[in-house]
Interface confidence: low
């Protein structure tokens, strides 16, 4: 939207003559009539597509016009237009003689012209005046144009509308060219975005004015960028909301539970080494020399059972002595001068004879163990359980009882909850130590993400006989995608039964 | 400045449709009408239609029941569609800037043969 | 539909020659008419617009004229250049029609 002007500034007919060479009596008395149109490589009739105007009678023969010329006349002559100026034109003014007071064509003689000039050409927008002067062999008019938008409308062809705000809206002015230039603090498309706090997290946090930040869910600190950990969660760190991811050597859902006692506690005393074997358990290997569960006592040389087949240990200044059973010699009473025929194995063990009957070996049962099967074996001394698993004798079997989350023999697999795909309507799952969280597509909530969100148009359920209801362009749009047998806007006519339109 | 182009096939076979588009560029043509016209080799020139700047149509009587003009002026495009083509449709199109004809495409040669 | 009648079909002349090319209009046209130039293997250009205004661009050695529903298109002092094919244009009423065209040769 904008204004041709037009300023009439001279006219000179100095003979006071018509075009048709007539003389007017007792002189012309001058008004002009101005059609503005698209450009024509050549003006030629046709309707002032762009608009037309005409003037009061401005003057006699020869005369200057005025700004504001009395008779009430207005220079310079606007002649406003609502579309995109194209940034060509042509333009005719036409000087005419007004014998009467009548101006109306219908009210003049054929041949009251005076005189007619067309030009054409480009004309951008701007405030500058173009001046220009036109003579035929018995007239003269000098005048000047411009193009200039109206209030509101900017750019190179008034095309563009801006009108400045500070509200819910947008908050910007004006630029030359219609594009907004945003108040300080604002930002977006139309300005309409407050600039948050400088280095607020861009998805963690928000605002609502300028240079806030107000934290999403799950979310704290001056800049929204430190998550909140799992309510309870004691030696745990998080990288996104309501995890709880445990410090080195703390386990459990909240990391409460010690699975690091030889580091905060330990334990193990006279340089042994310590090894944690599961929550707030742990296992002293001794140095030499020492014994007990923390390596908390000195041995003596005899503690370390040096002595076989029942032997028994003596401490003497520079070590020990075995003091051997019957059928037994060597420093640790390890040969034998029993045979099978002594029925030297325990527990059940069978006696095998070697060297012709001169010694013998025991194969021993499930369960036992040593020379003469005289030792129970604990399965369980290994530490066979994967994952904090309790390892239980069962006659001549261990078990593994898993802690929760875990499976297999050794309890070294880890149960994923998201195998089962508990979330639905496209939701991401996640597997936690205990369980899993569910995060839910657009449109959907709940710890399954089965609880669906009405969003737009569709939240009114317009769409009747079990139709689906797709949101269009803009959200407040609906499209019904109908069952078979059903039409109408709404699926809301059987087929059978076709509407009755008005026409 | 004003600029008018003609794009579409060259060849075309007996009986089948052609189509032909005209690119405007430099001036509106909401406001401009466009009019085609051809010419068989070595022969004069033939109006065939025109779409003026308000949409509506005119087309040269003898090719009315063939020939069909329209256009998207988002695109500043005219579209020329003809159907049962024959051997005697082989020419020249132009399109050309209705009013006066001052401005003209440098034509695109059609010919019709099998 | 408005006819027109061009004449002559052909004609040669030498340089510096005045040619005279006529159309005559089945109907009154008013002004409604223009004069084309074409040259081989290019598109016609505007030479008179309004019956008997010059175009921009066009020499001055052109010129149009009417008498009624006869319109003339005259070329003075001849050039080489000239050579091409004169075509006239009803644009008064829909269907718009052309001459049949006058081939000039120098």
């Known amino acids: 939207s904008g204004v041709f002007q037009l300023q009439l500034q001279e006219f000179a007919n100095e003979r006071g003559v018509l075009a048709s060479g007539r003389r007017c009596e007792p002189g012309c008395r001058t008004f002009f009539r101005v059609c503005l149109k698209h450009f024509q490589a050549v003006v030629s009739p046709g309707p002032c597509t762009f608009g037309s105007v005409s003037t009061p009678v401005l003057g006699t023969n020869s005369f200057a016009v005025g700004d504001d010329s009395s008779g009430g006349g207005r220079n310079p002559l606007q002649l406003p237009f609502n579309f995109t100026w194209p940034g060509t034109f042509s333009l005719i003014i036409e000087a005419w003689h007004a014998p009467g007071d009548d101006l109306r064509p219908e009210a003049l003689p054929p041949d009251a012209l005076i005189s007619k000039i067309a030009i054409q050409g480009s004309l951008p927008v701007g405030q500058k005046w173009l001046l220009d002067e036109q003579t035929s062999p018995l007239t003269r008019l000098r005048y000047s144009y411009r193009v200039i938008c109206s209030d509101n409308y900017y750019g190179d062809s008034c095309s563009r509308l801006c009108k400045k705000r500070n509200d819910h809206f947008g908050h910007y002015v004006c630029q030359p060219d219609g594009s907004l230039s945003c108040l300080p603090g604002w930002t977006g498309e139309y300005c309409e975005q407050p600039v948050c706090l400088s280095g607020c997290h861009e998805q963690n946090g928000y605002c609502s004015k300028p240079a806030e930040c107000i934290c999403r869910p799950g979310w704290q600190g001056r800049l929204c960028n430190e998550c909140i950990p799992h309510n309870g969660c004691r030696h745990g760190t998080c990288s996104t909301p309501w995890q709880c991811t445990c410090d080195e050597g703390w386990g459990g859902l909240f990391c409460d539970q010690d699975l690091n006692y030889c580091t905060h506690h330990s334990p193990c005393k006279n340089g042994a080494t310590c090894s944690n074997s599961g929550q707030r358990s742990y296992t002293c290997t001794c140095r030499p020399g020492y014994t007990g569960v923390d390596c908390e006592l000195e041995l003596s040389e005899c503690d370390s059972n040096p002595c076989r087949n029942g032997g028994s240990c003596k401490d003497q200044e520079d070590g020990y002595r075995c003091l051997c059973p019957p059928g037994y010699y060597g420093l640790h009473c390890e040969h034998s001068t029993l045979t099978c025929a002594d029925s030297p194995c325990f527990n059940g063990g069978s006696c095998q004879e070697r060297n012709q009957g001169a010694s013998y070996a025991c194969e021993c049962p499930p369960n036992f163990t040593g020379s003469n099967c005289e030792k129970k074996v604990d399965r369980c001394t290994s530490n066979p359980c994967a994952n904090g698993g309790q390892c239980l004798n069962r006659g001549p079997n261990r078990v593994c009882r898993c802690r929760p989350g875990f499976t297999g023999a050794h309890c070294e697999l880890h149960i994923s909850d998201c195998a089962r795909s508990p979330c639905a309507h496209g939701g991401t799952c996640h597997d936690l130590e205990t369980g899993f969280v569910c995060t839910c597509p657009a449109g959907f909530s709940g710890r399954r993400c089965e609880v669906r969100i009405p969003t737009e148009a569709c939240a009114s359920g317009p769409c009747l006989n079990g139709a689906t209801c797709y949101t269009g362009l803009p959200p407040d749009n609906f499209v019904c995608n109908c069952p078979y047998g059903f039409v109408g806007s709404r699926c809301e006519f059987p087929v059978s039964m076709p509407p009755s339109f008005p026409w | 400045q004003v600029q008018l182009k003609e794009s579409g096939p060259g060849l075309v076979q007996p009986s089948q449709t052609l189509s032909l588009t005209c690119t405007v560029s430099g001036i509106s043509i909401s406001i401009y009408g466009v009019s085609w016209v051809r010419q068989p080799p070595g022969k004069g020139l033939e109006w065939m239609g025109g779409?003026?700047?308000?949409?509506?149509?005119d087309y040269n009587s003898a090719l009315k029941s063939r020939l069909s003009l329209s256009r998207d002026t988002s695109k500043s495009q005219v579209f020329l569609k003809m159907n049962s083509l024959q051997t005697e449709d082989t020419a020249i199109y132009f399109c050309t800037l209705s009013g006066d004809f001052d401005y003209w495409g440098h034509g695109v040669l059609v010919t019709v043969s099998s | 539909d408005i006819q027109l009648t061009q004449s002559p079909a052909s004609l040669s002349a030498s340089l510096d020659e005045i040619v005279t090319i006529t159309c005559q209009a089945s109907?009154?046209?008013?002004?409604?008419l223009a004069w084309y130039q074409q040259k081989t293997g290019k598109s016609p250009q505007l030479l008179i617009y309004g019956a008997t205004s010059l175009a921009g661009g066009v020499p001055s050695r052109f010129s149009g004229s009417r008498s009624g529903t006869q319109y003339s298109l005259k070329i003075s002092k001849l050039q080489v250049e000239d050579t091409g094919i004169y075509y006239c244009?009803?644009?008064?009423?829909?269907?718009?029609?052309f001459g049949s065209g006058t081939k000039l040769e120098i």
């Open positions: 779409i003026w700047g308000d949409g509506s149509t």
């Open positions: 244009l009803q644009h008064y009423r829909a269907p718009f029609t």
């Open positions: 109907l009154d046209i008013g002004n409604w």
